[in-house]
């Protein structure tokens, strides 16, 4: 069937980087500037993608490629092929309707993007705290009380962690 | 063809004001949401104010109590009333069509202004 159609069909021998060309009897043209096709066969090429704005050039657009973009600093991307980009928060904060807001007490997120998680609950694995959780950070657990055997050397119990506060932005 | 051109920008002191306009055209303004995001010299671009179309407005907390966004439909105008300017809002402002209407999210869709600078020194 291939055969048959390359036969009937003189657009099917027109590559990549070109469209054929109806206005010419068909024949293969190139892409115009800012186009491109990434398969043969093509009747039109495709508009190149633009990164403008937010959005930063990642990868140039080819006559067989589309241009890929990236977001520029201060935010990151979400969605096939990066379609959005979204503003970073700081460790310990996530991004609301309102902006970058601190993490809840007993929460936290240890990176520049996504929501606050709840700190791990030790005790659910019958483990103890061996480091409190921060905005930034969440709990260590640590053995349970009854793997710490008399006379062990016990770890120091940590700091009560300090009332949460709205750190300065 | 979509257009949105920046002006108002200029040189301030600490403390002074500054109104920023963005005319539109080339699409429905009525019924779009729009922003304003700034870039600092060296810095990377940061989401400042929006507002939706039924005049809904969210601003970064930098700017809260400061920055004013408001939008005529009438004239295809967004504004930006900026008082007690500070050294540190120093920045080219950029006005864009905010079509994801998140707060600080952008689409590839979304469309941008050549922006304008904004100086704040003594």
């Known amino acids: 069937f291939e055969r048959t159609r390359s036969l009937q069909d003189p657009c099917s021998n027109c590559p990549a980087g070109t469209f054929c060309d109806n206005n010419r009897n068909q024949i293969c043209s190139p892409c115009p500037p800012n186009s491109f096709s990434s398969a043969g066969g093509q009747r039109t090429c495709d508009i190149c993608r633009q990164c403008k704005g937010v959005f930063r050039t990642r990868k140039e657009c080819s006559s067989t490629s589309n241009a890929e973009c990236d977001c520029t600093p201060g935010f990151h991307c979400l969605g096939a092929g990066c379609s959005m980009c979204e503003q970073d928060c700081k460790q310990g904060q996530e991004l609301t309707k309102k902006g970058c807001k601190d993490c809840c007490f007993g929460t936290f997120n240890d990176q520049k993007r996504g929501i606050c998680r709840p700190w791990t609950n030790c005790s659910l694995d019958g483990k103890s705290v061996l480091v409190n959780g921060t905005k930034e950070r969440d709990v260590v657990c640590g053995p349970s009380p009854a793997d710490l055997s008399p006379g062990a050397s016990s770890v120091t119990p940590p700091a009560p962690a300090r009332e949460p506060g709205h750190s300065p932005q | 063809e979509v257009q949105l051109l920046e002006s108002g920008g200029g040189l301030v002191q600490p403390g002074g004001s500054l109104r920023l306009s963005c005319a539109a055209s080339?699409?429905?303004?009525?019924?779009?949401?729009m922003s304003w995001a700034r870039q600092a010299p060296g810095k990377g671009l940061e989401w400042v104010s929006g507002?939706?179309?039924?005049?809904?407005?969210y601003y970064t907390e930098s700017v809260k109590d400061r920055f004013t966004i408001s939008r005529d439909n009438s004239k295809n105008t967004l504004y930006l009333q900026m008082n007690s300017l500070r050294a540190e809002d120093t920045a080219v402002y950029y006005c864009?069509?905010?079509?994801?209407?998140?707060?600080?999210?952008?689409?590839?869709?979304?469309?941008w202004g050549q922006g304008t600078l904004v100086t704040v020194s003594s």
């Open positions: 080339g699409f429905t303004f009525s019924s779009s949401a």
């Open positions: 864009a069509k905010w079509g994801t209407l998140r707060f600080g999210v952008w689409a590839e869709y979304d469309h």
């Open positions: 507002i939706y179309s039924g005049g809904s407005t």
